[in-house]
């Protein structure tokens, strides 16, 4: 999906209003310095591409974040403010249902969500030059 035509300001407002708080809740009990940010993004469409990938694609050591509250809200925000996004996700959702696993918060998941927090922060500051 090409995130170029999303309403970035609305997605930012959704993040600031609620998604950010859910990410903090997920990470509660973890020190902010515990994980290094290794994933970056260069502009808002790129940030949303990376956010979608880290939120919804299973990775080694973190089978699924998709049922977490921050993930469900992220999916909803993209569906509302990215035209045509919902349609592209129907097949992906059906595939995910087949491989749904029990929710387990592993250290790998915490690291992944820490990376997500960094991507969201970068999404909110699009005019900052890449380090």
């Amino acid at each position: 999906y090409d995130f170029t035509n999303c309403d970035f300001e609305k997605i930012k407002a959704a993040y600031l209003s609620t998604i950010s708080k859910d990410l903090i809740t997920y990470m509660s009990g973890t020190k902010s310095t515990e994980f290094n940010n290794t994933v970056s993004c260069s502009n808002r469409p790129h940030c949303l591409t990376e956010i979608q990938s880290l939120t919804f694609n299973p990775t080694a050591g973190c089978a699924s974040l998709a049922k977490e509250m921050f993930a469900m809200k992220t999916k909803a925000a993209l569906a509302i403010w990215c035209p045509g996004y919902s349609e592209t996700q129907i097949n992906a959702t059906q595939a995910m249902k087949k491989r749904r696993k029990r929710k387990v918060t592993t250290n790998k998941c915490l690291e992944q969500v820490s990376q997500l927090q960094g991507l969201w922060r970068r999404f909110n500051r699009p005019l900052l030059k890449q380090q």
């Epitope: 609305k10 209003s17 609620t18 809200k73 909803a76 925000a77 569906a79 509302i80 403010w81």
Partner: nanobody, 132 residues
Framework: QVQLVESGGGLVQAGGSLRLSCAAS????????ITWFRQAPGKEREGVSY????????YYADSVKGRFTISSDNAKNTVYLQMDSLKPEDTAVYYC?????????????????????????WGQGTQVTVSS
Amino acid sequence: QVQLVESGGGLVQAGGSLRLSCAASGFTFDDYAITWFRQAPGKEREGVSYISNNDHNTYYADSVKGRFTISSDNAKNTVYLQMDSLKPEDTAVYYCAAEGRMGTHSRESSYFWTFPALYDYWGQGTQVTVSS
């Protein structure tokens, strides 16, 4: 240009009723979500009730469930808030607000409808005072 005009506020005794109206113009009403917010003195603006003019799905704040009813008349481009069994704590300025994408995504909007920052257009507000 876009306009939202609220009316119907006033002074009412506890246990009484009022019907607020929000008349909209200047945008494609059927695609929009309209939400009633309220703001009491010294408090944050809070979402009261949401309606999608697309599929007429509705949401309510817990504090008004069973007492308030939101409805819309697409032919008149107007949304109504019927407020029954009013309590002194319902005293506030009531605003209607409109958002252009939540109307066509009412299921997903359940996560976001209460957040003022997401709305494009606002009315000027109407005062509701409930005396005990």
